[in-house]
């Protein structure tokens, strides 16, 4: 099996943003995600 | 873009309570999330509290939940914060800010405009 290793020489932050869920539907209360690299994964 | 101007800061001694209002003009307020955020000297501005455009929907800072209370009034474009069982470390300068409808609410960013800020100070 290959072997793959992170060792990019850079720290890559996360950041949890939160987004009201009726910007987006109907539904109420806020939705939770988690920005890693710039990229929203969750 | 909407104008955004803080009151009700002041002196209160630890466990007391305030509350805060921030006044908007412009037409468009109720399509923008609002949120209150602190600034205690030398630190960076943090979040504290957000309130959907509508009113419906609320989300807290771990460190005031439970204690503080974010409201807003779409007839009389303002939103407030009652904040109770105040303490020292609730010191800061606050702000009221609008975000567009869409953005992260708990990041400084999101925000486009910003009132001047009013001054807690909780006295031990």
């Known amino acids: 099996d290959a072997e793959f290793r992170h060792d990019s020489g850079y720290e890559v932050h996360h950041q949890k943003l939160v987004f009201f869920a009726e910007d987006v539907g109907s539904n109420k209360g806020a939705i939770i995600g988690l920005m890693v690299g710039g990229v929203v994964i969750a | 873009e909407v104008q955004l101007v803080e009151s009700g800061g002041g002196l209160v001694q630890a466990g007391g309570s305030l509350r805060l209002s921030c006044a908007a003009s412009?037409?468009?307020?109720?399509?923008?999330?609002m949120g209150w955020f602190r600034q205690a000297p030398g630190k960076e501005r943090e979040f504290v509290a957000a309130?959907?455009?509508?009113?419906?929907?609320?989300y807290y800072a771990d460190s005031v939940k439970g204690r503080f209370t974010i409201s807003r009034d779409n007839a009389k474009n303002a939103v407030y914060l009652q904040m109770n069982s105040l303490k020292p470390e609730d010191t800061a300068i606050y702000y009221c800010?609008?975000?567009?409808?869409?953005?992260?609410?708990?990041?400084?960013?999101?925000?486009?405009?910003w009132g001047q800020g009013t001054q807690v100070t909780v006295s031990s």
């Open positions: 309130v959907s455009r509508s009113g419906v929907s609320t």
């Open positions: 412009g037409r468009t307020f109720n399509n923008y999330n």
């Open positions: 800010g609008a975000a567009y409808r869409g953005t992260a609410i708990n990041v400084r960013r999101s925000y486009d405009s």
